[in-house]
């Protein structure tokens, strides 16, 4: 299923513009002497922006109003209405959409699209390539690890290169990368699985410059409002990749009648987008620090952050949790297709396949499922949490702790109606993947209003890092181990294809049970965690005498 | 539905080697475990084995270790049974089978009868 | 191993009810499934399945088969018997390696 790249990135794409940009803000204040200023604008795909006084927030559940934060007997500062009209305030030009960088940001979104699109190809035809090249459960879950592992190692690097180099160039070059690698993959002989291993960790590497490197361009293009719809389309391109690659590889294996085909599929579109961004992005300028930011910057070390972050008990228990949700939905995506089709060879609705295409209708269906409880787990969480927020000041955290509880009985309802039901598991997997993503906005937005606007792209980096680490770069193939193990102390046959794969994936629900207590323990601390960040971002706004106005 | 075609009637010297073939066609769709199975008019149906077509792996009943040895074509989709060291209490009809389900035996071949006489 | 123990033989009239018993020494029930099997065999043919998971009819099976039981007692029932059924009717148990069968049940006419 869709990684948390959705998670953390939606709240902190393009994390260094933003708080280039929350320093600009600043220092327009600071210039006007304004007294204190709060964080004006929207802050990236829907992350809150921190502010200082009883002002509204922006984020992706909606604006929620904060009680004004200072020392007791302190009125609360203006809020970003009366400072942005003060005497010699620079005025935001209108966001207007202009045609050009609309186009950019569509193909860039539809870029995305295509790197999640081919990353699920793969779950798509996974019983495929069992059988092709004769791996057991274990081999065919280490595809989707080493992929993940490589672009986990990768990202960083990207974002790296990212800040120096001709971004649009790296992009171009990442997709025409993993295009190459992917069209070539599917000309492996039998014999040379470990081959496609290595494939997959080559497309990790090239797919990871994108998801690093687009959405700071994106960033770049647009600003407030118009920055917060655009990062929300791109990132919303996650499901909808993850389920068209699911329906991808089942239909054009079923229509060209051999599974080699839909590795061929995303490579030529691959390298349809790679040309379009090399001719219709415009090569953007990173967004410039202020001397304010300046300072901020030279104030605090990367060191400094860390031990910052590490010490951020909401900060680190939303990460946890964020991992959990990553090896769940990492693990369901990559087996639920081939457990369901298992599920009904036991049932005798389908045959045990032996000679592709195999399974193409539970990819097709699966697909199609997530591409929608994608969507609608973000819209859900985000209205709940909203509600919510009137009723208390832990809702974010409670709301991702009720759905990951929620989801987790779900998910333990799959194993029980895929031994009577497809119908029925079909119901349950919708109903729990609904609930297990509905925590995607809102985990961004905890993390920011834990984390000063200087640390947010540190704490997304280390939390997108944390959360393959410890979620989607090991689960599927541990699941494939888990299988492999208790079939061989059973024993191989139908029925025990199905079953030991089912208890394997039971792992998921408790892992899902441990991310709804880290929301739980995030919950406890959330409000003390906000509050110092919101005093910190006041302490860092008061202009510094050394500054010349 | 996949249907299982056996090699015709054996007749074999003891201490000597069979081989019985059984082609699977039909539904793209076939089993991965073909099985073999023995009957007898005093023993009555018992279990050989099965061979994954797929990963090639395969299981014996342990009555059956070492007379037995189940192989697999995947190109040709043909399961093969050896049955090596005759004697006349190998003398029964042999039947390849498709393991599916909750491992039950869903389709059947129509049988070898294998003979061994001197 | 699991050994199923089955009467020898039936002998119904035509039209009447048949029930065939099968005993096995010890519960083939695992993780909600029955794993007992029924397949008839006709004289000079393979075995066909008729039942599996002790009371599901297999394809193409006629309704006036079914199957019953749970943990070590299951019957197969032939209601009402026709003059096709006459064959030698054997259960089988999945659940535990090697896959045993039942000395078989020979159904004939009265």
């Known amino acids: 299923m869709m990684c948390l790249e959705c998670a953390s990135a939606a709240a902190g794409g393009a994390e260094e513009e933003e708080a280039d940009a929350e320093r600009r803000r600043r220092r327009r204040g600071a210039q006007r002497g304004a007294g204190g200023s709060g964080c004006c604008g929207a802050r990236g795909a829907g992350g809150a922006g921190v502010s200082a006084a009883g002002d509204e927030v922006q984020t992706l559940s909606g604006s929620v109003r904060r009680a004004p934060t200072g020392p007791p007997g302190t009125p609360g500062t203006p809020g970003c209405a009366a400072t942005a009209k003060g005497p010699g305030a620079q005025q935001p030009k209108p966001a207007s959409l202009g045609r050009g960088r609309g186009a950019a940001a569509a193909i860039l979104s539809l870029g995305n699209v295509l790197n999640y699109l081919d990353r699920y190809t793969v779950a798509g035809v996974l019983l495929d390539i069992q059988q092709h090249f004769g791996v057991k459960d274990r081999g065919a879950g280490l595809l989707q690890s080493v992929f993940i592992c490589s672009f986990m190692v990768a990202a960083p690097i990207f974002g790296y290169l990212g800040d120096r180099f001709n971004r649009k160039v790296i992009l171009s070059c990442g997709i025409f990368f993993w295009s190459a690698v992917t069209f070539s993959s599917s000309f492996i002989p039998q014999q040379y699985f470990w081959l496609l291993v290595l494939s997959r960790g080559l497309v990790g590497i090239g797919e990871a410059s994108y998801s690093t490197i687009a959405p700071t361009i994106i960033g770049d293009l647009f600003t407030k409002n118009t920055r917060t719809l655009m990062l929300s389309v791109f990132y919303f391109a996650i499901p909808l990749g993850s389920g068209l690659g699911y329906i991808t590889g089942s239909s054009v294996k079923q229509a060209a009648g051999d599974w080699h085909w839909a590795l061929r599929v995303s490579p030529v579109l691959g390298m349809i987008t790679g040309t379009l961004i090399l001719i219709l992005v415009p090569a953007t300028k990173r967004g410039h620090a202020d001397q304010l930011g300046d300072q901020l910057k030279a104030r605090t070390s990367w060191l400094r952050d860390m031990k910052a972050l590490i010490r951020n008990r909401s900060y680190v228990f939303s990460s946890l949790a964020t991992s959990a949700v990553s090896f769940a939905t990492g693990a369901l995506g990559m087996w639920i297709p081939l457990y369901l089709h298992r599920a009904q060879v036991v049932q005798k609705t389908a045959e045990t396949c032996n000679s592709p295409p195999c399974g193409a209708k539970d990819s097709l269906i699966f697909g199609a499922i997530t591409c929608f409880t994608g969507f609608l787990g973000v819209v859900t969480g985000a209205g709940a949490t909203r509600w919510c927020r009137l009723k208390t000041q832990r809702a974010d955290p409670l709301v991702c702790a009720v759905g990951m509880l929620g989801s987790a009985i779900f998910i333990c309802l799959i194993f029980v109606a895929a031994k009577s039901s497809i119908v029925g598991a079909y119901i349950c997997i919708f109903v729990g993947e609904t609930l297990l993503f509905s925590n995607w906005a809102i985990t961004a937005d905890i993390l920011m209003y834990v984390v000063i606007p200087t640390r947010r792209a540190t704490a997304v980096a280390l939390q997108s890092f944390t959360s393959h680490l410890l979620g989607d770069a090991g689960s599927p193939y541990l699941i494939g181990f888990i299988s492999d193990l208790i079939r061989q102390s059973t024993k191989d046959s139908p029925l025990w294809e199905f079953l030991s794969l089912g208890y394997a994936l039971m792992l998921c629900p408790f892992v899902v049970v441990l991310g709804g207590m880290f929301f739980l323990a995030t919950a406890l601390f959330f409000v003390s965690d906000r509050a110092r960040a919101e005093q910190q971002v006041n302490q860092l706004a008061m202009p510094p005498a050394s500054v010349k106005v | 539905q996949v249907q299982l075609q056996q090699s015709g009637v054996e007749l074999a010297k003891p201490g000597s080697s069979v081989k019985i073939s059984c082609k699977a066609s039909g539904n793209t769709f076939t089993s991965n475990y073909i099985t073999w199975i023995k009957q007898t008019p005093g023993q009555g149906l018992e279990y050989i084995g099965y061979?994954?077509?797929?990963?090639?792996?395969?299981y014996y009943n342990e009555k059956f270790k070492g007379k037995a040895t189940l192989t697999a074509d995947k190109s040709s989709s043909t399961a093969f049974m050896q049955l090596s060291s005759l004697t006349p209490d190998d003398s029964a009809v042999y039947f390849c089978?498709?393991?599916?389900?909750?491992?039950?035996?869903?389709?059947w071949g129509q049988g070898v009868m294998v003979t061994v006489s001197s | 191993d699991i050994v199923l123990t089955q009467s020898p033989a039936l002998a119904p009239s035509l039209g009447q009810r048949a029930t065939i018993s099968c005993r096995a020494s010890q519960s083939v029930r695992m993780s909600g499934y029955n794993l007992m099997h029924w397949y008839q065999q006709k004289p000079g043919q393979q075995p066909k399945l008729l039942i599996y998971?002790?009371?599901k009819l297999a394809s193409g099976i006629p309704a006036r088969f079914s199957g019953s039981g749970s943990g070590t007692d299951f019957t197969l029932t032939i209601d009402p018997v026709q003059s096709d059924d006459i064959a030698t009717y054997y259960c089988?148990?999945?659940?535990?390696?090697?896959?045993?069968f039942g000395a078989g049940t020979k159904l004939e006419l009265r």
């Open positions: 089978a498709s393991l599916t389900g909750v491992d039950y035996f869903d389709d």
């Open positions: 089988q148990q999945s659940k535990d390696d090697p896959y045993t």
């Open positions: 998971d002790a009371s």
């Open positions: 061979i994954n077509t797929g990963s090639g792996k395969t």
